[in-house]
Protein backbone atom coordinates (compact mmCIF):
# COMPACT_ATOMS: atom_id res chain seq x y z
CA UNK A 1 0.00 0.00 0.00
CA UNK A 2 2.15 3.11 -1.37
CA UNK A 3 -0.19 5.45 0.54
CA UNK A 4 2.31 7.86 1.66
CA UNK A 5 3.07 9.40 -2.16
CA UNK A 6 -0.48 9.19 -3.61
CA UNK A 7 -1.83 10.91 -0.34
CA UNK A 8 0.72 13.53 -0.44
CA UNK A 9 0.33 14.27 -4.42
CA UNK A 10 -3.70 14.08 -3.57
CA UNK A 11 -3.78 16.20 -0.62
CA UNK A 12 -1.39 18.74 -2.46
CA UNK A 13 -4.24 18.79 -5.31
CA UNK A 14 -6.54 18.86 -2.96
CA UNK A 15 -5.57 22.22 -1.01
CA UNK A 16 -4.61 23.48 -4.32
CA UNK A 17 -8.19 23.57 -5.49
CA UNK A 18 -9.23 24.39 -1.98
CA UNK A 19 -7.24 27.55 -2.71
CA UNK A 20 -8.92 28.40 -5.42
CA UNK A 21 -12.20 28.42 -4.43
CA UNK A 22 -12.23 31.65 -2.94
CA UNK A 23 -14.70 34.26 -4.77
CA UNK A 24 -14.24 36.85 -2.28
CA UNK A 25 -11.47 38.83 -0.95
CA UNK A 26 -10.38 37.35 2.57
CA UNK A 27 -9.84 40.82 3.58
CA UNK A 28 -13.55 41.55 4.10
CA UNK A 29 -13.89 39.18 5.96
CA UNK A 30 -11.58 39.64 9.17
CA UNK A 31 -14.55 40.36 11.92
CA UNK A 32 -16.16 36.99 10.83
CA UNK A 33 -12.85 34.86 12.30
CA UNK A 34 -13.84 31.68 14.78
CA UNK A 35 -11.97 29.78 17.05
CA UNK A 36 -13.18 26.12 15.87
CA UNK A 37 -10.53 24.69 18.12
CA UNK A 38 -8.98 22.27 15.58
CA UNK A 39 -7.57 18.77 18.06
CA UNK A 40 -4.08 19.86 17.51
CA UNK A 41 -2.58 19.30 20.51
CA UNK A 42 -4.43 15.47 20.94
CA UNK A 43 -2.55 14.90 17.71
CA UNK A 44 0.43 16.05 17.65
CA UNK A 45 0.75 14.57 21.19
CA UNK A 46 0.50 11.53 19.97
CA UNK A 47 2.44 8.80 17.88
CA UNK A 48 0.16 6.97 15.46
CA UNK A 49 0.16 3.44 14.37
CA UNK A 50 -0.46 3.00 10.11
CA UNK A 51 -4.39 1.84 10.96
CA UNK A 52 -4.91 4.46 13.34
CA UNK A 53 -3.48 7.12 11.01
CA UNK A 54 -5.65 5.55 8.21
CA UNK A 55 -8.97 5.83 10.12
CA UNK A 56 -8.31 9.45 11.55
CA UNK A 57 -7.21 10.38 7.82
CA UNK A 58 -10.21 8.76 6.67
CA UNK A 59 -12.76 10.70 9.03
CA UNK A 60 -11.16 14.11 8.34
CA UNK A 61 -11.72 13.51 4.80
CA UNK A 62 -14.94 11.80 4.75
CA UNK A 63 -16.00 15.33 6.78
CA UNK A 64 -14.88 17.95 4.71
CA UNK A 65 -16.19 15.64 1.78
CA UNK A 66 -19.89 16.00 3.62
CA UNK A 67 -19.31 19.31 4.22
CA UNK A 68 -18.68 20.88 0.55
CA UNK A 69 -21.29 18.35 -0.64
CA UNK A 70 -24.33 20.36 1.08
CA UNK A 71 -26.61 22.30 -0.99
CA UNK A 72 -25.00 25.39 0.83
CA UNK A 73 -21.93 24.43 -0.43
CA UNK A 74 -22.94 23.97 -3.69
CA UNK A 75 -24.37 27.99 -3.72
CA UNK A 76 -21.49 29.14 -2.23
CA UNK A 77 -18.75 27.92 -4.62
CA UNK A 78 -17.83 28.01 -8.22
CA UNK A 79 -19.60 24.60 -9.48
CA UNK A 80 -16.35 23.03 -11.74
CA UNK A 81 -13.91 23.80 -9.05
CA UNK A 82 -16.01 22.30 -6.26
CA UNK A 83 -16.32 19.19 -8.02
CA UNK A 84 -12.97 18.43 -9.20
CA UNK A 85 -12.05 18.87 -5.25
CA UNK A 86 -14.74 16.50 -4.17
CA UNK A 87 -13.60 14.35 -6.87
CA UNK A 88 -10.56 14.80 -5.60
CA UNK A 89 -11.40 13.62 -1.80
CA UNK A 90 -13.61 10.60 -3.00
CA UNK A 91 -10.37 9.50 -4.83
CA UNK A 92 -8.26 10.28 -1.27
CA UNK A 93 -11.22 7.95 0.23
CA UNK A 94 -10.88 5.53 -1.56
CA UNK A 95 -6.87 5.27 -1.41
CA UNK A 96 -7.35 4.92 2.32
CA UNK A 97 -10.12 2.36 2.05
CA UNK A 98 -8.03 0.71 0.33
CA UNK A 99 -5.02 0.13 2.37
CA UNK A 100 -7.09 -0.43 5.46
CA UNK A 101 -8.50 -3.55 4.03
CA UNK A 102 -4.50 -4.02 2.79
CA UNK A 103 -3.94 -3.55 6.90
CA UNK A 104 -6.30 -5.86 8.37
CA UNK A 105 -5.00 -8.01 10.76
CA UNK A 106 -3.05 -5.25 12.17
CA UNK A 107 -3.45 -5.11 15.82
CA UNK A 108 -4.27 -1.38 17.05
CA UNK A 109 -6.37 0.19 20.54
CA UNK A 110 -9.86 0.63 19.04
CA UNK A 111 -11.12 2.60 21.73
CA UNK A 112 -8.04 4.77 22.06
CA UNK A 113 -8.94 5.48 18.19
CA UNK A 114 -12.33 6.17 18.75
CA UNK A 115 -11.46 9.24 20.89
CA UNK A 116 -9.49 10.83 18.09
CA UNK A 117 -12.43 9.81 15.40
CA UNK A 118 -14.88 11.72 18.38
CA UNK A 119 -12.51 15.17 18.52
CA UNK A 120 -12.59 15.01 14.63
CA UNK A 121 -16.40 14.99 14.61
CA UNK A 122 -16.97 17.49 16.95
CA UNK A 123 -14.39 19.78 15.42
CA UNK A 124 -16.60 19.62 12.24
CA UNK A 125 -19.85 20.19 14.06
CA UNK A 126 -18.06 23.52 15.00
CA UNK A 127 -17.48 24.29 11.69
CA UNK A 128 -21.38 23.40 10.61
CA UNK A 129 -22.72 25.34 13.41
CA UNK A 130 -20.98 28.30 12.66
CA UNK A 131 -21.89 28.02 9.44
CA UNK A 132 -25.76 27.70 10.46
CA UNK A 133 -25.08 30.77 12.93
CA UNK A 134 -24.02 32.76 10.45
CA UNK A 135 -26.35 31.29 7.68
CA UNK A 136 -23.73 30.56 5.29
CA UNK A 137 -22.87 33.66 4.16
CA UNK A 138 -19.82 34.10 1.97
CA UNK A 139 -17.29 35.26 4.56
CA UNK A 140 -18.41 32.59 6.84
CA UNK A 141 -17.56 29.98 3.66
CA UNK A 142 -14.22 32.02 3.18
CA UNK A 143 -13.12 31.73 6.92
CA UNK A 144 -14.39 27.57 6.74
CA UNK A 145 -12.24 27.63 3.46
CA UNK A 146 -8.92 28.97 5.39
CA UNK A 147 -9.58 26.49 8.43
CA UNK A 148 -9.97 23.34 6.50
CA UNK A 149 -6.52 24.22 4.35
CA UNK A 150 -5.17 24.97 8.23
CA UNK A 151 -6.46 21.52 9.16
CA UNK A 152 -4.81 19.35 6.29
CA UNK A 153 -1.90 21.04 7.22
CA UNK A 154 -2.19 20.37 10.32
CA UNK A 155 -2.54 16.44 9.88
CA UNK A 156 1.44 15.75 9.56
CA UNK A 157 1.57 13.89 12.50
CA UNK A 158 -0.75 11.59 10.95
CA UNK A 159 0.95 11.35 7.78
CA UNK A 160 4.08 10.42 9.57
CA UNK A 161 2.08 7.52 10.85
CA UNK A 162 1.45 6.07 7.36
CA UNK A 163 5.39 6.04 6.69
CA UNK A 164 5.30 3.85 9.73
CA UNK A 165 5.61 0.42 9.64
CA UNK A 166 3.47 -1.50 12.12
CA UNK B 1 12.58 28.68 12.82
CA UNK B 2 10.34 31.30 11.49
CA UNK B 3 12.33 34.29 10.21
CA UNK B 4 11.26 37.49 8.14
CA UNK B 5 14.79 38.75 7.26
CA UNK B 6 14.59 43.01 5.34
CA UNK B 7 16.59 44.49 3.51
CA UNK B 8 19.10 47.04 4.60
CA UNK B 9 18.82 50.45 5.33
CA UNK B 10 18.51 52.78 2.54
CA UNK B 11 19.15 56.77 2.12
CA UNK B 12 17.59 58.29 -0.55
CA UNK B 13 16.83 61.45 -2.16
CA UNK B 14 13.29 63.06 -3.07
CA UNK B 15 11.79 61.98 -5.81
CA UNK B 16 13.61 58.31 -6.30
CA UNK B 17 11.92 55.40 -6.27
CA UNK B 18 12.63 52.50 -3.58
CA UNK B 19 11.37 48.59 -3.29
CA UNK B 20 12.22 47.15 0.02
CA UNK B 21 11.85 43.64 0.61
CA UNK B 22 11.36 40.85 3.42
CA UNK B 23 11.89 37.55 2.94
CA UNK B 24 10.01 35.00 5.09
CA UNK B 25 11.81 31.37 5.96
CA UNK B 26 10.70 28.45 8.39
CA UNK B 27 6.89 28.26 7.32
CA UNK B 28 4.30 27.86 4.54
CA UNK B 29 4.92 31.60 3.17
CA UNK B 30 1.62 31.38 0.98
CA UNK B 31 -0.16 30.09 4.69
CA UNK B 32 0.24 33.59 5.74
CA UNK B 33 -0.34 37.50 5.14
CA UNK B 34 2.41 39.58 5.32
CA UNK B 35 1.45 43.07 6.38
CA UNK B 36 3.48 46.22 6.90
CA UNK B 37 3.36 48.79 9.21
CA UNK B 38 5.75 52.30 9.55
CA UNK B 39 7.38 53.76 12.15
CA UNK B 40 8.16 57.11 12.02
CA UNK B 41 11.01 59.11 14.03
CA UNK B 42 9.72 58.83 17.99
CA UNK B 43 6.39 58.05 17.02
CA UNK B 44 3.75 55.02 16.65
CA UNK B 45 3.33 51.79 14.89
CA UNK B 46 1.30 52.74 11.87
CA UNK B 47 -0.49 49.82 9.92
CA UNK B 48 0.20 50.49 5.91
CA UNK B 49 -1.54 47.21 4.28
CA UNK B 50 -1.16 43.59 3.83
CA UNK B 51 -0.79 41.33 1.35
CA UNK B 52 -1.86 37.55 0.90
CA UNK B 53 0.71 35.71 -1.20
CA UNK B 54 -0.94 33.24 -2.76
CA UNK B 55 -2.51 34.96 -5.17
CA UNK B 56 -1.29 38.85 -4.34
CA UNK B 57 -4.43 40.09 -3.35
CA UNK B 58 -3.36 43.61 -1.42
CA UNK B 59 -5.63 45.70 0.85
CA UNK B 60 -3.93 49.45 2.37
CA UNK B 61 -4.87 51.73 4.67
CA UNK B 62 -6.40 55.01 3.00
CA UNK B 63 -3.48 56.60 4.26
CA UNK B 64 -1.52 54.82 2.37
CA UNK B 65 -3.82 53.72 -0.91
CA UNK B 66 -2.12 55.56 -3.74
CA UNK B 67 1.55 55.96 -2.38
CA UNK B 68 3.06 53.12 -1.89
CA UNK B 69 2.23 49.56 -3.25
CA UNK B 70 2.89 45.95 -2.20
CA UNK B 71 3.78 43.02 -4.09
CA UNK B 72 5.13 39.63 -3.28
CA UNK B 73 7.04 36.41 -5.34
CA UNK B 74 5.95 33.78 -3.80
CA UNK B 75 8.62 31.30 -5.72
CA UNK B 76 10.77 33.26 -3.39
CA UNK B 77 9.11 33.56 -0.61
CA UNK B 78 9.27 37.74 -0.38
CA UNK B 79 7.13 40.52 -0.08
CA UNK B 80 7.82 43.74 -1.14
CA UNK B 81 7.24 47.54 -0.46
CA UNK B 82 7.94 49.87 -3.03
CA UNK B 83 7.63 53.96 -3.48
CA UNK B 84 8.12 55.36 -7.18
CA UNK B 85 8.32 58.97 -6.10
CA UNK B 86 9.79 59.15 -2.53
CA UNK B 87 8.96 62.32 -0.16
CA UNK B 88 11.22 63.68 2.92
CA UNK B 89 7.96 62.27 4.98
CA UNK B 90 8.51 58.88 3.73
CA UNK B 91 11.54 59.10 6.30
CA UNK B 92 10.87 56.03 8.78
CA UNK B 93 11.08 52.49 10.07
CA UNK B 94 9.55 50.10 8.05
CA UNK B 95 8.30 46.52 9.41
CA UNK B 96 7.17 43.29 8.07
CA UNK B 97 5.19 41.02 9.97
CA UNK B 98 3.34 37.91 9.55
CA UNK B 99 -0.37 37.25 9.66
CA UNK B 100 -2.28 34.27 9.92
CA UNK B 101 -5.52 35.58 7.24
CA UNK B 102 -8.65 34.48 8.77
CA UNK B 103 -7.49 31.78 10.63
CA UNK B 104 -7.89 31.82 14.78
CA UNK B 105 -4.19 32.16 15.15
CA UNK B 106 -1.80 35.12 16.62
CA UNK B 107 -1.55 38.21 14.41
CA UNK B 108 1.51 39.30 13.91
CA UNK B 109 3.60 36.99 15.62
CA UNK B 110 6.68 37.11 13.65
CA UNK B 111 8.24 40.54 12.64
CA UNK B 112 11.18 41.35 10.76
CA UNK B 113 14.15 43.42 11.99
CA UNK B 114 13.15 46.69 10.34
CA UNK B 115 14.26 48.63 7.20
CA UNK B 116 15.44 51.85 7.90
CA UNK B 117 14.52 54.46 5.28
CA UNK B 118 15.93 57.83 4.96
CA UNK B 119 14.83 60.63 2.59
CA UNK B 120 17.32 63.68 2.67
CA UNK B 121 18.28 66.07 0.13
CA UNK C 1 -11.67 53.35 10.79
CA UNK C 2 -11.75 52.55 14.10
CA UNK C 3 -9.68 54.20 16.60
CA UNK C 4 -7.72 53.00 19.45
CA UNK C 5 -7.53 55.23 22.34
CA UNK C 6 -4.94 54.34 25.01
CA UNK C 7 -4.36 55.49 28.06
CA UNK C 8 -2.16 56.72 30.20
CA UNK C 9 0.60 57.91 27.28
CA UNK C 10 3.03 57.30 30.36
CA UNK C 11 3.61 55.89 33.58
CA UNK C 12 6.73 55.67 35.92
CA UNK C 13 6.74 52.77 38.33
CA UNK C 14 8.84 50.55 40.07
CA UNK C 15 10.50 47.01 40.21
CA UNK C 16 7.22 44.57 41.48
CA UNK C 17 4.32 47.01 40.90
CA UNK C 18 1.34 46.11 39.57
CA UNK C 19 0.89 47.89 35.99
CA UNK C 20 -2.01 48.66 34.48
CA UNK C 21 -2.40 50.28 30.71
CA UNK C 22 -6.21 50.73 29.20
CA UNK C 23 -7.18 50.77 25.44
CA UNK C 24 -10.59 51.92 24.48
CA UNK C 25 -12.16 51.38 20.31
CA UNK C 26 -14.20 53.66 18.62
CA UNK C 27 -16.58 50.93 17.96
CA UNK C 28 -17.20 47.32 19.44
CA UNK C 29 -14.48 44.91 18.19
CA UNK C 30 -15.65 41.88 20.48
CA UNK C 31 -12.37 40.07 21.15
CA UNK C 32 -10.35 40.93 18.30
CA UNK C 33 -7.41 43.02 20.01
CA UNK C 34 -3.73 42.27 20.15
CA UNK C 35 -1.00 43.88 22.56
CA UNK C 36 2.53 44.41 21.11
CA UNK C 37 5.86 45.66 23.83
CA UNK C 38 8.40 47.67 21.93
CA UNK C 39 12.08 48.57 23.08
CA UNK C 40 14.10 51.42 21.75
CA UNK C 41 15.12 50.09 18.47
CA UNK C 42 13.45 46.85 18.03
CA UNK C 43 10.97 45.29 16.42
CA UNK C 44 7.58 45.14 18.34
CA UNK C 45 6.92 41.45 19.79
CA UNK C 46 3.20 40.09 20.40
CA UNK C 47 2.31 39.68 24.25
CA UNK C 48 -1.20 38.83 23.76
CA UNK C 49 -3.90 38.22 21.14
CA UNK C 50 -7.40 38.08 20.74
CA UNK C 51 -7.96 40.06 24.11
CA UNK C 52 -6.82 37.42 26.67
CA UNK C 53 -4.66 34.58 25.18
CA UNK C 54 -0.94 34.87 26.42
CA UNK C 55 1.92 34.76 23.14
CA UNK C 56 3.74 31.32 23.46
CA UNK C 57 6.63 32.17 25.39
CA UNK C 58 5.27 35.61 26.82
CA UNK C 59 5.76 35.54 30.78
CA UNK C 60 3.06 34.58 32.81
CA UNK C 61 2.80 38.12 34.50
CA UNK C 62 1.13 39.79 31.39
CA UNK C 63 -2.53 39.13 31.04
CA UNK C 64 -4.91 40.55 28.80
CA UNK C 65 -8.82 40.92 29.23
CA UNK C 66 -11.91 43.40 28.32
CA UNK C 67 -14.45 42.59 25.72
CA UNK C 68 -16.60 45.41 22.82
CA UNK C 69 -14.47 48.71 23.27
CA UNK C 70 -12.88 48.59 26.73
CA UNK C 71 -9.52 46.66 27.09
CA UNK C 72 -6.52 46.07 29.80
CA UNK C 73 -3.25 45.07 29.83
CA UNK C 74 -2.08 44.39 33.45
CA UNK C 75 1.28 43.40 34.56
CA UNK C 76 1.21 41.87 37.51
CA UNK C 77 4.57 41.95 39.03
CA UNK C 78 7.01 44.66 36.89
CA UNK C 79 10.62 43.24 36.08
CA UNK C 80 13.31 45.26 34.53
CA UNK C 81 13.06 44.29 31.09
CA UNK C 82 9.52 44.88 31.40
CA UNK C 83 10.40 49.00 30.59
CA UNK C 84 8.90 49.61 27.11
CA UNK C 85 6.56 51.23 25.03
CA UNK C 86 3.13 49.26 24.61
CA UNK C 87 0.45 49.20 21.71
CA UNK C 88 -2.93 47.81 21.69
CA UNK C 89 -3.81 47.08 18.01
CA UNK C 90 -7.74 46.37 16.78
CA UNK C 91 -7.70 43.16 14.84
CA UNK C 92 -11.25 43.24 13.78
CA UNK C 93 -11.46 44.86 10.48
CA UNK C 94 -9.47 46.66 7.91
CA UNK C 95 -8.00 49.10 8.03
CA UNK C 96 -5.92 47.66 10.74
CA UNK C 97 -5.40 50.49 13.71
CA UNK C 98 -3.35 50.68 16.83
CA UNK C 99 -2.92 52.86 19.94
CA UNK C 100 -0.90 55.40 20.35
CA UNK C 101 1.16 53.91 22.76
CA UNK C 102 1.80 53.94 26.61
CA UNK C 103 5.60 54.49 27.38
CA UNK C 104 6.50 52.53 30.62
CA UNK C 105 9.38 54.18 32.32
CA UNK C 106 11.59 53.31 36.05
CA UNK C 107 10.49 55.63 38.65
Known amino acids: CDLPQTHSLRNRRALILLAQMGRISPFSCLKDRHEFRFPEEEFDGHQFQKTQAISVLHEMIQQTFNLFSTEDSSAAWEQSLLEKFSTELYQQLNDLEACVIQEVGVEETPLMNEDFILAVRKYFQRITLYLMEKKYSPCAWEVVRAEIMRSFSFSTNLKKGLRRKD | EVQLVQSGAEVKKPGESLKISCKGS????????IGWVRQMPGKGLEWMGI????????AYSPSFQGQVTISADKSISTAYLQWSSLKASDTAMYYC??????????????WGQGTLVTVSS | DIQMTQSPSSLSASVGDRVTITCRAS??????LNWYQQKPGKAPKLLIYFASSLQSGVPSRFSGSGSGTDFTLTISSLQPEDFATYYCQQAYDFPLTFGQGTKVEIK
Open chain 2, 26 to 33: GYSFTSYW
Open chain 2, 51 to 58: IDPSDSDT
Open chain 3, 27 to 32: QSIDGA
Open chain 2, 97 to 110: ARHPGLNWAPDFDY
